[in-house]
């Protein structure tokens, strides 16, 4: 078990913070929540603390929770390919271009770390490029979320790793909005952290209202697990 | 509590250049990032550039890449802003700023601040 991975064996607190800036419309939104990494679940309530949001809420699931994946589940035969819990609680620094198909695009940095028992998740979003009526400005996204891959590999020069994934996006009129995202990731503090083998992490997220909520926010239920790696051939003659 | 004080500021005519520096005590900064953030009078503080103590990684505004340059002088806790080719749009209160992790653009990500030092070119 690494030092981090032993922040993360019960319940832990979740914050989130964003400033985003998309096409000069300026926003900032706060989350609350949970994160259990024995069951890789997370339980998140986001609010826009500027009035509406200016882009749907699904663009912003993989800069929110695709951001803590801490609390990944990483099952015992592949604990020695968590990079995101051994980096902990320095943290590690999360920095995505998100390029959405015949449109705009995303860039985030992120900084993920423990302020005292309470992960922080911090970001900063520009996004440029987007067509006034399209997808994403024109608000022409379900509000709901697709089950993704999230393939993972070791970047060695820079003590951390890269990773790439395509979100799709449903739209009203039933076609599908590609979202690719290219990740990097890389600790903030000195020490060791774990450099993985290729593999990937299945996510699996719902979105729903709180009733009693007047303002602009999502509410997320998340479960990611990793996988892609079998068991080490010792393990099949146990 | 940590202290920033910075200095090197003053009155400089277009295309010259001044080096602001930042001395920063109260702690030890291994995984800080120390920035420069600069205001005029009725508009918010915008980032300048920004460096982490390792010195991996940095950050330029586009209206100053190229003719600003951020560096770090670890074994003296002091970051320094070197300014070449200034411009009167440059004319700002700057400062200096730390926080622990990495480097934002956002200014309420930032913990510790400086007083401010004046640059004006004419």
């Known amino acids: 078990m690494s030092k981090g991975e032993e922040l993360f064996t019960g319940v832990v607190p979740i914050l989130v913070e964003l400033d985003g800036d998309v096409n000069g419309h300026k926003f900032s939104v706060s989350g609350e929540g949970e994160g259990d990494a024995t069951y890789g679940k997370l339980t998140l309530k986001f609010i826009c603390t500027t009035g509406k949001l200016p882009v749907p809420w699904p663009t912003l699931v993989t800069t929110f929770s695709y951001g803590v994946q801490c609390f990944s589940r990483y099952p015992d035969h592949m604990k020695q390919h968590d990079f995101f819990k051994s980096a902990m609680p320095e943290g590690y620094v999360q920095e995505r271009t998100i390029f959405f198909k015949d449109d705009g695009n995303y860039k985030t940095r992120a900084e993920v770390k423990f302020e005292g028992d309470t992960l922080v998740n911090r970001i900063e979003l520009k996004g440029i490029d987007f067509k006034e009526d399209g997808n994403i400005l024109g608000h022409k996204l379900e509000y709901n979320y697709n089950s993704h891959n999230v393939y993972i590999m070791a970047d060695k020069q820079k003590n951390g790793i890269k990773v790439n994934f395509k979100i799709r996006h449903n739209i009203e009129d039933g076609s599908v909005q590609l979202a690719d995202h290219y990740q990097q990731n890389t600790p903030i503090g000195d020490g060791p952290v774990l450099l993985p083998d290729n593999h990937y992490l299945s996510t699996q997220s719902a979105l729903s209202k709180d009733p009693n909520e007047k303002r602009d926010h999502m509410v997320l239920l998340e479960f990611v697990t990793a996988a892609g790696i079998t068991h080490g051939m010792d393990e099949l003659y146990k | 509590q940590v202290q920033l004080v910075e200095s090197g500021g003053g009155l400089v005519q277009a295309g010259g250049s001044l080096r602001l520096s930042c001395v920063a005590s109260?702690?030890?900064?291994?995984?800080?990032?120390m920035g420069w953030f600069r205001q005029t009078p009725g508009r918010e503080r915008e980032a300048v550039a920004a460096?982490?103590?390792?010195?991996?990684?940095?950050y330029y505004s586009d209206s100053v890449k190229d003719r600003f340059t951020i560096s770090i002088d670890n074994t003296r806790n002091t970051g320094y802003l070197q300014m070449n080719s200034l411009k009167p749009e440059d004319t700002a209160v700057y400062y200096c700023?730390?926080?622990?992790?990495?480097?934002?653009?956002?200014?309420?990500?930032?913990?510790?601040w400086g007083q401010g030092t004046q640059v004006t070119v004419s």
């Open positions: 460096i982490t103590w390792s010195a991996h990684s940095t």
């Open positions: 700023t730390v926080r622990h992790g990495t480097w934002f653009t956002t200014s309420r990500y930032w913990t510790d």
């Open positions: 109260g702690r030890t900064f291994s995984g800080y990032a």
